[in-house]
Amino acid sequence: EVEKTACPSGKKAREIDESLIFYKKWELEACVDAALLATQMDRVNAIPFTYEQLDVLKHKLDELYPQGYPESVIQHLGYLFLKMSPEDIRKWNVTSLETLKALLEVNKGHEMSPQVATLIDRFVKGRGQLDKDTLDTLTAFYPGYLCSLSPEELSSVPPSSIWAVRPQDLDTCDPRQLDVLYPKARLAFQNMNGSEYFVKIQSFLGGAPTEDLKALSQQNVSMDLATFMKLRTDAVLPLTVAEVQKLLGPHVEGLKAEERHRPVRDWILRQRQDDLDTLGLGLQG
């Protein structure tokens, strides 16, 4: 913490500008008014302050807003956001998507930090649900965002938001997460025709029950092996050889390459050898 010292004569800052980069830490503390800093936060990012100087500026804002910064200040934090701790961020009330975008931009290209995770958590909790615009924004910055949520948190995603989800957003989701997302996707895409529906629902099928897979097998969907490998084991096991053959179509030959992997191995083990032989792939139950 910087010691309280009087501002030298003629050094009192009238605006936030580049001259301040030549100020020592104690001079910044003594000569920059916190209220002035708050109203001119947008200028801070254009000035090449050192990390030490940014610490002083943060300290001044903390003194001015001990209960947490107002959104007018938060929106213009820029690189000063990187100085915030999760504890600081928990005091904030961020409601504007523009504010969220501005702060995510600062962290762009990096993995999700604890600060960003706290910011997102505060924002989503404040909104009450993950609406489509928020989901669009978050997955644009962090494709793995959706899969970082717990099944409980995912339950607050309305079906309408599912339209914003891209296949790559689900890459790291586990079965428990897909169990929550699949019914929402099914509801969201229910009015689409067969082939269009399959294209949209495909990345969510890791949460599909057996009866839905059986239904898909009757629709000539030609599911690829990558999708089949992500299906729930309990959903795959009851499928007959004929149903799997119909579900995969020309991709059924790919089972041979995956015969030692789950869930294919588990499924093969539970089929009659005579049925497996009809595939002509040399699969051994």
């Epitope: 490998m229 191995r265 083990l269």
Partner: antibody
Framework: QVQLQESGPGLVKPSETLSLTCTVS??????????WSWIRQPPGKGLEWIGY???????NYNPSLKSRVTISVDTSKNQFSLKLSSVTAADTAVYYC???????????WGQGTMVTVSS | DIQMTQSPSSLSASVGDRVTITCRAS??????VNWYQQKPGKAPKLLIY???SLQSGVPSRFSGSGSGTDFTLTISSLQPEDFATYYC?????????FGGGTKVEIK
């Protein structure tokens, strides 16, 4: 509730065949959702999976032991067995039988039986 | 075959500490990784399956995360009964490999 119990000789001579049996009680070896595994642990070392069997008789073995291992199942006795041929001192270990639940993992284990290979 | 590499091989910690053990697969095992706890002279006990699902009866201080090649077992607040050896295992590939183990000792 399902319980597993290993049985068999605690001492085997080098070059001979190690034979162990696992008896399943409180449940059936013919369970649709289970395979039945043998796992071993040399003294002071980590766990090594040996192989599994399904009630249909289908087996899957650890590639490094495949040439010496035979696992069989007797559904009428609710048992499955391990045979490991041409044993050496390196096969000295605690041998466990375990149930592999297809949805979870090795959720039920026997208490283990120590087998020493020595002349 | 998929090889599982655990780290650290041993660690010392105090009651109440947060403990993290990692397991790296030589190739993707998707979300198919299980974690076991073993105490001296006892059979292993299943703690976590499918990377993050808590086995029935296991205290909620145990949690798992990860997918692909990197997996983590976390004990949020170490209890006296948690001092043991922990193993990861992959059931994705038919070789069913275990990690080398991590021994958690009292500091």
């Amino acid at each position: 509730q399902v319980q597993l119990q290993e049985s068999g000789p605690g001492l085997v001579k080098p070059s001979e065949t190690l034979s162990l049996t696992c008896t399943v009680s409180g449940g059936s070896v013919s369970s649709y959702y289970s395979t039945w595994s043998w796992i071993r642990q040399p003294p002071g070392k980590g766990l090594e999976w040996i192989g599994y069997i399904y009630y249909s008789g289908s087996t899957n073995y650890n590639p490094s032991l495949k040439s010496r291992v035979t696992i069989s199942v007797d559904t009428s006795k609710n048992q499955f067995s391990l045979k490991l041929s041409s044993v050496t001192a390196a096969d000295t270990a605690v041998y466990y039988c375990a149930r592999d639940n297809v949805f979870t993992g090795f959720d039920i284990w026997g208490q283990g039986t120590m087998v020493t290979v020595s002349s | 075959d998929i090889q599982m590499t655990q780290s650290p091989s041993s660690l010392s910690a105090s009651v109440g500490d947060r403990v993290t053990i990692t397991c790296r697969a030589s190739q993707s095992s998707r979300y198919y990784v299980n974690w076991y706890q073993q105490k001296p002279g006892k059979a292993p006990k299943l703690l976590i399956y499918a990377a993050s699902s808590l086995q029935s009866g296991v205290p909620s201080r145990f949690s798992g995360s990860g997918s692909g090649t990197d997996f983590t077992l976390t004990i949020s607040s170490l209890q006296p009964e948690d001092f043991a050896t922990y193993y990861c295992q992959q059931p994705y590939d038919a070789s069913y490999t275990f990690g080398g183990g991590t021994k958690v000792e009292i500091k």
